[in-house]
């Protein structure tokens, strides 16, 4: 699996999950989240050659097409597969509120 | 929706489904499919700016991050959303066989 266990400990050039820390204030301009100040969101990056963690029948065909037509702009793309939630604290008036923001952290990637 | 109805009739620069015809023999090197000779597979292409058909909470965050950090390599990617099957005919010996290959045709795209 192209997950954090494999990708963070290798020098993989193909589609893999990469480290990315997002500071809510600096990177998003968000002041409304009290805690945490930022989080390890991660992101997916890298080419998707033939048979590399391909998502569907279509992505197999497209990877094969791309292999035979390397100049073509049609190619599978490396995108999130498994996502995890992030618990946050924000204020409503003076009252702190805890909420889970779903699908916020990338744990693994796929070629789609 | 970023589907064939909208995308094929517009000059949309952002993420949209684009026309792509794949000739099985010329593009994939396949002789084993008897019918059809090729098909309109289509593909997804175009940038994914903030709020453009974003798939998850994470892709919204990443698009916003990208807006604030335009040089960053972390950005959502335009990938297939709705896929349709393709019926094919091939031969096993002298016997024709009809099969539906699932998820072969892109009907719409999303930013993931």
């Amino acid at each position: 699996a192209l997950d954090t266990n494999y990708c963070f400990s290798s020098t993989e050039k193909n589609c893999c999950v990469r480290q990315l820390y997002i500071d809510f204030r600096k990177d998003l301009g968000w002041k409304w989240i009290h805690e945490p100040k930022g989080y390890h969101a991660n992101f997916c990056l890298g080419p998707c050659p033939y048979i590399w963690s391909l998502d569907t029948q279509y992505s197999k065909v497209l990877a094969l097409y791309n292999q035979h037509n390397p100049g073509a702009s049609a190619a599978p793309c490396c995108v999130p597969q498994a996502l995890e939630p992030l618990p946050i604290v924000y204020y409503v008036g003076r009252k702190p509120k805890v909420e889970q923001l779903s699908n916020m952290i990338v744990r693994s990637c796929k070629c789609s | 929706a970023l589907d064939t109805n909208y995308c094929f009739s517009s000059t949309e620069k952002n993420c949209c489904v684009r026309q792509l015809y794949i000739d099985f023999r010329k593009d994939l090197g396949w002789k084993w499919i008897h019918e059809p000779k090729g098909y309109h597979a289509n593909f997804c292409l175009g940038p994914c700016p903030y709020i453009w058909s974003l798939d998850t909470q994470y892709s919204k965050v990443l698009a916003l991050y990208n807006q604030h950090n335009p040089g960053a390599s972390a950005a959502p990617c335009c990938v297939p959303q709705a896929l349709e099957p393709l019926p094919i005919v091939y031969y096993v010996g002298r016997k024709p066989k009809v099969e539906q290959l699932s998820n072969m045709i892109v009907r719409s795209c999303k930013c993931s």
Partner: nanobody, 120 residues
Framework: QLQLVESGGGLVQPGGSLRLSCTAS???????????MAWFRQTPGKQRELVAL??????NYADSVKGRFTISRDNAKNTVYLQMNMLQPEDTAVYVC????????????WGQGTQVTVSS
Amino acid sequence: QLQLVESGGGLVQPGGSLRLSCTASGSTFEIYPIYAMAWFRQTPGKQRELVALTTDVKTNYADSVKGRFTISRDNAKNTVYLQMNMLQPEDTAVYVCNVGVVRGGLQNYWGQGTQVTVSS
């Protein structure tokens, strides 16, 4: 039972040659069409890298092996070959074959791999 058996690996000196073969056995390979056959290689701590790929009438090679390696197939024997010439130490790896079969969709099967070591 589906099986891919590779052979032909071994120890060879730089500049030498080897011919790998991968034979697909099992009823699936006789009944269903093969849509692609490929050779990949794997070095310790790295994922598999595509070396060569063949479909019915097209072949494709990694830049690092172009002009030195040749992929071919014998449909009657359900076998794919990899002729490797002018081998270099950086070609040292486990070579694994992959066969794509049309069986309720595009299915892929992996072999166990054969070790190729290029050293003087």
